[in-house]
Interface confidence: low
């Protein structure tokens, strides 16, 4: 009779993480008598996966009933596959011996490859805000995928970006991989509503890529433009001076009025109007009692935006243009409000 052969018909098996792997193995003869064992890896350090004779292997089930006398099918199923299960599996026939069974024949091995989906890409931007015309870096990370081949693309508002660098780690062989990419984005004043998108395509995603997004509203700072104007009021001895604060983002803003360098009033932007591009406008006004001043008045609107150094705009108020009540001691009117 021809000597027993151990047949592993599948050179390789590809299984998605979480699924069950079937590793096929048949013997060509019932002789010699002895059990089958499954191992992962070769050499002295092989890892026992299943022993027909003894042991507890909760993830392994046999395809056929190994207790039947004429059984020659030693295929197994391994449940809940993870990337860590990847490797070469060998079906090994043992010959009954005393005191121990002796290895008789090994199958040629089946390479188990595990397909694992990448995690949802996480996009993170710079720690500090930046102003338009500056270049900022965004990073995208995704982990736990296998095989190693993966495609990553960057978009800004649907337009593909080209200035980015991507690494897949580790370089060598591994049960699963991670991808890390850094993209450079030039900010514009219109970017408050913009989004940066990192898109990851992998064989496990069946053409439906994963996306991670970052809102540029968390990255951009648009500094305000200031305009100070003077409006006449019905009362002859009063002047209304307004400070228009335009096109700023984020909303955090504090405004201080100075009369001849002395603080007159400080207020925080609250009731703002939003522009279509996501920036804000705000207006503050100051009612000045001209009769309280003998000389010309320098009015300054000073704005501190989002913790940045203050910017200011000044307006010179000519007192000589109001001769009436010039000697009066009435105090300048300090109350004011911001208007929508």
């Amino acid at each position: 009779e021809e000597e027993l052969q151990v047949i592993q018909p599948d050179k390789s098996v590809l299984v998605a993480a979480g699924e069950t792997a079937t590793l096929r193995c048949t013997a060509t003869s019932l002789i010699p008598v002895g059990p089958i064992q499954w191992f992962r890896g070769a050499g002295p350090g092989r890892e026992l996966i299943y022993n027909q004779k003894e042991g507890h292997f909760p993830r392994v089930t046999t395809v056929s009933d190994l207790t039947k006398r004429n059984n020659m099918d030693f295929s197994i199923r391994i449940g809940n596959i993870t990337p860590a299960d990847a490797g070469t599996y060998y079906c090994v026939k043992f010959r009954k011996g005393s005191p121990d069974d002796v290895e008789f024949k090994s199958g040629a091995g089946t390479e188990l490859s595990v397909r694992a989906k990448p995690s949802a890409p996480v996009v993170s931007g710079p720690a500090a805000r930046a102003t338009p015309q500056h270049t900022v870096s965004f990073t995208c990370e995704s982990h736990g995928f296998s095989p190693r081949d993966i495609t990553l693309k960057w978009f800004k508002n649907g337009n593909e970006l080209s200035d980015f660098q991507t690494n897949v780690d580790p370089v060598g062989e591994s049960v699963s991989y991670s991808i890390h990419s850094t993209a450079k984005v030039v900010l514009t004043r219109e970017d408050v509503h913009s989004q940066v998108i990192c898109e990851v395509a992998h064989v496990t995603l069946q053409g439906d890529p994963l996306r991670g997004t970052a809102n540029l509203s968390e990255t951009i700072r648009v500094p305000p433009t200031l305009e100070v104007t003077q409006q006449p009021v019905r009362a002859e001895n009063q002047v209304n001076v307004t400070c228009q604060v335009r096109k700023f983002y984020p909303q955090r803003l504090q405004l201080t009025w100075l009369e001849n360098g002395n603080v007159s009033r400080t207020e925080t932007a609250s009731t703002v109007t939003e522009n279509k591009d996501g920036t804000y406008n705000w207006m503050s006004w100051l009612l000045v009692n001209v009769s309280a001043h003998r000389d010309d008045v320098k009015l300054t609107c000073q704005v501190e935006h989002d913790g940045q150094p203050a910017v200011s705009k000044s307006h010179d108020l000519k007192v000589s243009a109001h001769p009436k009540e010039q000697g009066s001691n009435t105090a300048a009117e300090n109350t004011g409000s911001n208007e929508r």
Epitope: G41, R46, T88, Y90, D101, V102, E173
Partner: antibody, heavy 123, light 112 residues
């Protein structure tokens, strides 16, 4: 193509240290035990160390002549393994080969060898 | 350690002749799993050793059938039925059953 490639050899003074590297390609590196073997005219072929798989907690074994002086390690992410050699002696001079047990689970044997890297210990 | 003793040290042969190399281990080299991990290697000048025979008598893939191995316990033999020019070099036996693994001292096969 199944391949092992050693590097890191050279000239070192007695008592000195040296680290050899071996990069594997063309086979599933994590599945196999890795070995270092050296050769010199005086001592012939001499097996010196082996390192097991992750599933065997990277167990190591050494020849008596290098125990306590040499340390074998592996880095699966780089498909590489290493031999850190300390307190080198003249008798450690030779060609160092990395080699591995592969192919068949029941029939292990050193069937893949690198081309070797030469270590010379001399003052 | 298991000492592997090879004889002869040098073996002059004519092409087409049969050649036999002996290897004796200082102790039984049967592994605890029942297998005997006795291997034979050929090393040609300037090259690393190449595996010929594993587990006493199994020819490694690509090795011509003129090479055969035999033996058990502590005594092992490598035979080359008809020596060809490409067979010249140094032959080593090796035991992979007991740590530390050990090689024989080598047998140089050369032309008479």
């Amino acid at each position: 193509e199944v391949k092992l490639e050693e590097s890191g050899g050279g000239l070192v003074q007695p008592g000195g240290s040296m680290k050899l590297s071996c990069v594997a390609s063309g086979f599933t590196f994590r599945n196999y035990w890795m070995n270092w073997v050296r050769q010199s005219p005086e001592r012939g072929l001499e097996w010196i160390a082996e390192i097991s798989l992750k599933s065997n907690t990277y167990a190591t074994h050494y020849a008596e002549s290098v125990k306590g002086r040499f340390a074998i390690s592996r880095d699966g992410s780089k498909s590489s393994f290493y031999l850190q050699m300390n307190d080198l002696r003249a008798e450690d001079t030779g060609i160092y080969y990395c080699t591995t047990f592969t192919k068949v689970v029941a029939d292990w044997h050193l069937d893949v060898w690198g081309a070797g890297t030469t270590v010379t210990v001399s003052s | 350690d298991v000492l592997m003793t090879q004889t002869p040290l040098s073996l002059p042969v004519s092409l087409g002749d049969q050649a036999s190399i002996s290897c004796r281990s200082s102790q039984n080299i049967v592994h605890s799993n029942g297998n005997t991990y006795l291997e034979w290697y050929l090393q040609k000048p300037g090259q690393s050793p190449k595996l010929l025979i594993y587990k006493v008598s199994n020819r490694f893939s690509g090795v011509p059938d003129r090479f055969s191995g035999s033996g058990s316990g502590t005594d092992f033999t490598l035979r080359i039925s008809r020596v060809e020019a490409e067979d010249l070099g140094v032959y080593y036996c090796f035991q992979g059953s007991h740590v530390p693994f050990t090689f024989g001292s080598g047998t140089k096969l050369e032309i008479k």
